[in-house]
């Protein structure tokens, strides 16, 4: 006869471990008992449980309610047991000793491996600003047993670096993702991917990149000279810029206050029916938490009744 077991039994923390021990012998052989023990290099052999063909299962008080036999129907020569709710301290070597009649005793050892799945955490780096050099975008840490794998999944160009710390029963892995911030990265996902044998599928944590920037400002609205004549309605100046965080807009007139009737609506300056008093230098001031930009334009409103004057529109930034 011989014993059938597994060299290694792998179980996830908190699950039940099946410790297999099958006796393959002649049908007329009887299994008297199966003794299960924990083999510790320091503490020696410690009994877990005894499965007796006549008296049933006896469990060491230290493992009370944690060791059980699977319910019937069971092969009478099956000495497998279940170790409930495996913890890291259960990791180690186990021995199954089968006493048979008339063939005698057989023993086999196996190693129980308890996987501790990681609970990853992602920490964003300092605020990203366009114009910075290589900057930490995010770091991702996962601790488990064995050491988890931590990688990054993103379309963004950058560099990753990992370091690990080994603890007595686990290992922590931290991976950092560095990049040179640019506005094109705004809203792009940066995903930390954690792989581990104790996970059914990879764990993924996504961080959305935010890069602070402010684009140059420019003013639109002077392209059609016919709009800027006395009496015309609907003339507007629009300030063009973009930024993160979204910028605020402010309109002023360089050579005095804004004329009455001129309305400011965010990035747009709306004019009432035009008069020559609307001529002047207008300044758009764009700002966010990162920076500010200005753009100015000179508007001259032509009076068609005054033939000596040509339309003269000058734009300057």
């Amino acid at each position: 006869g011989e014993l059938e077991t597994s060299d290694v039994v792998t179980v996830v923390l908190g699950q039940d471990a099946k410790l297999p021990c099958f006796y393959r012998g002649d049908p007329d052989e009887q299994v008297g008992q199966v003794a299960w023990a924990r083999v510790d290099p320091n503490e020696g052999i410690r009994e877990l449980a005894l499965l007796h063909s006549k008296y049933g299962l006896h469990v060491n008080p230290a493992y009370e309610d944690r060791v059980e036999q699977p319910p019937p129907p069971r092969d009478p020569l099956d000495g497998s047991v279940l170790l409930r709710n495996a913890v890291q301290a259960d990791e180690g070597e186990y021995e199954c000793r089968v006493s048979t009649f008339p063939a005698g005793s057989f023993q086999a050892r196996m190693r129980l491996r308890v996987l501790v799945p990681p609970l990853p955490s992602l920490n964003p780096g300092p605020p990203l600003e366009e114009g910075q050099g290589l900057t930490l975008a995010a770091s991702c840490t996962a601790e488990g047993s064995p050491a988890p794998s931590v990688t990054w999944d993103t379309e963004v160009k950058g560099t990753q670096s990992s370091r690990s710390f080994t603890h007595p029963r686990s290992a922590a892995v931290t991976s950092e993702f560095h990049l040179v911030p640019s506005r094109s990265m705004n809203g792009q996902p940066l995903t930390c991917v954690v792989s581990h044998p104790g996970l059914l599928q990879d764990r993924r944590i996504t961080h959305t990149l935010q890069v602070a920037f402010l684009a140059e400002a420019s003013v639109r609205g002077l392209e059609d000279q016919n709009l800027w004549q006395v009496g015309r309605e609907g003339a507007t100046l629009k300030c063009l810029s973009e930024g993160q965080p979204p910028p605020k807009y402010n309109w002023t007139r360089l050579d005095g206050p804004l004329p009455s009737g001129v309305r400011v609506k965010g990035d747009t300056l709306g004019f009432p029916p035009l008069t020559t008093e609307h001529s002047g230098v207008y300044v758009c001031h764009v700002s966010n938490e990162l920076s500010s930009r200005d753009s100015q334009v000179t508007v001259e409103v032509l009076d068609p009744e005054d033939p000596g004057k040509q339309v003269d529109l000058v734009s300057a930034s």
């Epitope: 059938e4 099946k18 699977p70 319910p71 092969d75």
Partner: antibody
């Protein structure tokens, strides 16, 4: 290689018994036991019972009173007998070898299609 | 009474796709679960035992997973020969019931 060949009737009268023989080759019945399973259109796959390598048996409680599984190791044969058949026992009956894990069915017979009718 | 619920009852997929079939049990069965494939007019064939161990000769595109009361069979990159009906079966307490089956049709 491992084979399980079944032999038995295809037609059984109501209230009569059904006997099927499963002859195995490629392994010993002293090393691996055998299951019996049936498949009917109405009930899908149904586990009926098992004979262990040591000769002891376990039956599905629903069939315990009318089912018997025995074997002859020297002839490499497993015998299935079910009494008091009715129309709803019409099914395909399979024998299957117990696998390396001690429970799953890793090789199956070709099946015996049994109709219970007068 | 002990229940084994298999889902879906049927599914249709294309060659190359990945499919997953699930079995739920009414109590913890501690990985005492097997998966079988059956083709029309043929006997079932063992694919996976002990919830996760691939039977001899079964292609690696098949994989079993799960624990406790929930188990899955995954088939990566479906092949034309994978059509048929799939069953799970538990071996925890009597009777060792089968799931109701999942009929997999190739689109």
């Amino acid at each position: 290689q491992v084979q399980l060949k079944q032999s038995g009737p295809n037609l059984v009268q109501p209230s009569q018994s059904l006997s099927i023989t499963c002859t195995v080759s490629g392994f010993s019945l002293t090393t691996y036991g055998a299951h019996w399973v049936r498949q009917s259109p109405g009930k899908g796959l149904e586990w009926l019972g098992v004979i262990w390598r040591g000769g002891s048996t376990d039956y599905n409680a629903a069939f315990m009173s009318r089912l018997s599984i025995t074997k002859d190791n020297s002839k490499s044969q497993v015998f299935f007998k079910m009494n008091s058949l009715q129309a709803d026992d019409t099914a395909i009956y399979y024998c299957a070898k117990i696998g390396y894990d001690g429970y799953a069915m890793d090789n199956w017979g070709q099946g015996t299609s049994v109709t219970v009718s007068s | 009474d002990f229940q084994v619920t298999q889902s879906p009852a049927s599914l249709s997929a294309s060659v190359g796709e990945t499919v997953t079939i699930t079995c739920r049990t009414s109590e913890n069965i501690h990985n005492y679960l097997a998966w079988y494939q059956q083709k029309q007019g043929k006997s079932p064939q063992l694919l996976v035992y002990n919830a996760k161990t691939l039977a001899d000769g079964v292609p690696s595109r098949f994989s079993g997973s799960g624990s406790g009361t929930q188990y899955s069979l995954k088939i990566n990159s479906l092949q034309p020969e994978d059509f048929g009906t799939y069953y799970c079966q538990h071996f925890w307490s009597s009777p060792w019931t089968f799931g109701g089956g999942t009929k997999l049709e190739i689109k």
